[in-house]
């Protein structure tokens, strides 16, 4: 065999170069035929009207032809013929890669509720070969289930992802990423998850700052409720008792002036939205007022240069409990 060709892989719309090479040239006619066995070039003459075929090089040892704006219909075997006796023939296969025409992501629900399982579909249309679809939730790769539909040598791939959503997923992108030999770089589409969740309630003591509640002091608690949608109702109640008469409620704030022991108990902040309700409890314990501290005693001896100061602080015996948990979220 004296005639050589190489297979060609080209992306749709780009340029394919077909080369027929003769090792030992003897001025025999070289001819290039298309998959329908029509002559594209006979030496430097093109019988075919298709002007996408252009002669790049012609000599007794090579016939080199370019095919611009390649389409899927150009795919197939192209034959090089050398008119020796006997005639020689060799073929090159043009493979056309088609990137996906369209990448569409579709979420079953625009808004999901925490704990719910939602279906997300991603479709890569009309590619060749079939596209590989990968799923990511943020930076985490997830596993989907793909179905391939073939039509006229083209493939449409639909990948289905079943996703159980959590409140942390709110605002996180779900990314459908395509891998295909005709695609360089990252081809992806994404949708941001919108997850509704019941409120998370947290009680913050805004006064007193040091956190120790004593008789006669004031107490201010702020209820922070975060949810989606934002909680519509934030209420304060006293568990198993009436709210003290001197308690003042102002939106998410509870203010109790002039604390006394009768104020001891559990104060609950409740918040709700369309998803559900939640609460957080604060256990108030009012400590005795502080006892007065006597002036410090200083003993000085003339025999030494050392001064010893003894400071005695007398506090309520339960004061050590101030480090214990005072608020419980539910």
């Amino acid at each position: 065999q004296n005639l050589f060709t190489k297979d060609v892989t080209v992306i749709e719309g780009e340029v394919a170069t077909i080369s027929c090479q003769v090792n030992k040239s003897d001025d025999s006619v070289i001819q290039l035929l298309n998959p329908n066995r029509q002559t594209i070039y006979f030496r430097d003459f093109r019988p075919l009207k298709d002007s996408r075929f252009q002669l790049l090089n012609f000599s007794s040892s090579e016939l080199k032809v370019s095919l611009t704006n390649v389409s899927i219909s150009d795919e197939g075997r192209y034959f090089c013929q050398l008119y020796t006796d006997p005639p020689q023939e060799s073929y090159t296969t043009i493979t056309v890669l088609v990137p996906p025409r369209n990448l569409m992501i579709d979420i079953q629900k625009d808004t999901a509720v925490e704990g719910e399982e939602i279906e997300v579909n991603c479709t890569a249309m009309a590619s060749k070969p079939a596209t590989t679809i990968r799923w990511f939730k943020g930076n985490t790769e997830l596993k989907g289930k793909s179905e391939v539909e073939e039509w006229s040598d083209m493939y449409t791939v639909t990948s289905q992802l079943m996703l159980k959503v959590h409140k942390e997923d709110d605002g996180v992108p779900v990314i459908c990423q395509v891998e295909h030999p005709a695609v360089t770089g990252n081809l992806q589409t994404q949708r941001y998850l919108e997850v509704q969740y019941k409120p998370q309630v947290h009680i913050q003591m805004t006064y007193p700052l040091q956190g120790l509640t004593r008789e006669g002091d004031a107490l201010e608690l702020t209820c922070e409720a975060i949810g989606k949608p934002q909680p519509v109702m934030v209420t304060w109640v006293r568990v198993d008792d009436e709210m003290p008469q001197h308690a003042v409620l102002s939106g998410p704030n509870l203010f109790i002036n002039n604390l006394n022991k009768t104020d001891n108990g559990t104060y609950r902040c409740e918040a709700s939205n369309i998803v559900g309700k939640a609460h957080s409890d604060y256990m108030l314990y009012v400590y005795d007022p502080p006892t007065t501290i006597p002036p410090p005693t200083t003993t000085t001896t003339t025999t030494t240069t050392t001064t010893t100061t003894i400071l005695t602080i007398i506090t309520d015996s339960r004061a050590g409990e101030e480090g214990s948990i005072r608020a419980v979220d539910h």
Epitope: V29, T39, L48
Partner: antibody
Framework: EVQLLESGGGLVQPGGSLRLSCAAS????????MNWVRQAPGKGLEWVSG????????FYADSVKGRFTISRDNSKNTLYLQMNSLRAEDTAVYYC?????????????WGQGTL | QSALTQPPSVSVSPGQTARITCSGD??????VSWYQQKPGQSPVLVIF???KRPSGIPERFSGSNSGNTATLTVSGTRAMDEADYYC??????????FGTGTKVTVL
């Protein structure tokens, strides 16, 4: 004026040989591809063979491949067709035809033919 | 058996239009030429590359080619147009295939 004048036709036994000549004038012979076309009595036209302008390549119809040889002598402005192993079905008027010389391949001038 | 098929004959009145067809697989993808041959004479190129006229050929000769059919149209036919007409194309990988020929008679 372009002129093509064929000669060399005649009666020959099956298996015999003949050499046809075509004398060209009125154009730059060495710049054009040349061809032989034949027409059997009462039949249509059939292309037989073609040759490059400098004689560097030749091409034949399957029906004559291996039996006929086309050649040219640009110094004499003459085209030849050597016909060997002749068969009854080779009986025809043989025309030499000049190429139009465009990007295509068309026969714009023909000789009067030789039988 | 030619791969290019023409009607054996076409009759036309003087001054009328004669249409000669030439059929072949995917013919529209390649260039077609037309030759006129009067009795006892050599062929004459009248149309090349589907629709181009060589110098000296009257404007009444025109050509078209698409799909599987090429057509030679002779408008305002004259008695001098009476002849055999052959289409010619590169068919597949076979060069210079001539059609079966059409005899045009001017009535």
């Amino acid at each position: 004026e372009v002129q093509l004048l064929e000669s060399g036709g005649g009666l020959v036994q099956p298996g015999g040989s003949l050499r046809l000549s075509c004398a060209a004038s009125g154009f730059t012979f060495s710049s054009y591809k040349m061809n032989w076309v034949r027409q059997a009595p009462g039949k249509g036209l059939e292309w037989v063979s073609g040759i490059g302008s400098s004689g560097d390549w030749t091409f034949y119809a399957d029906s004559v491949k291996g039996r006929f040889t086309i050649s040219r002598d640009n110094s004499k402005n003459t085209l030849y067709l050597q016909m060997n192993s002749l068969r009854a079905e080779d009986t025809a008027v043989y025309y030499c035809a000049k190429d139009l010389g465009t990007s295509g391949w068309n026969f714009d001038y023909w000789g009067q033919g030789t039988l | 058996q030619s791969a290019l098929t023409q009607p054996p004959s076409v009759s036309v009145s003087p001054g009328q239009t004669a249409r000669i067809t030439c059929s072949g697989d995917r013919l529209g993808e390649t260039y077609v030429s037309w030759y006129q041959q009067k009795p006892g004479q050599s062929p004459v190129l009248v149309i090349f590359e589907d629709n181009k006229r060589p110098s000296g050929i009257p404007e009444r000769f025109s050509g078209s080619n698409s799909g599987n059919t090429a057509t030679l149209t002779v408008s305002g036919t004259r008695a001098m147009d009476e002849a055999d007409y052959y289409c010619q194309a590169w068919v597949g990988s076979t060069p210079f295939v001539f059609g079966t020929g059409t005899k045009v008679t001017v009535l």
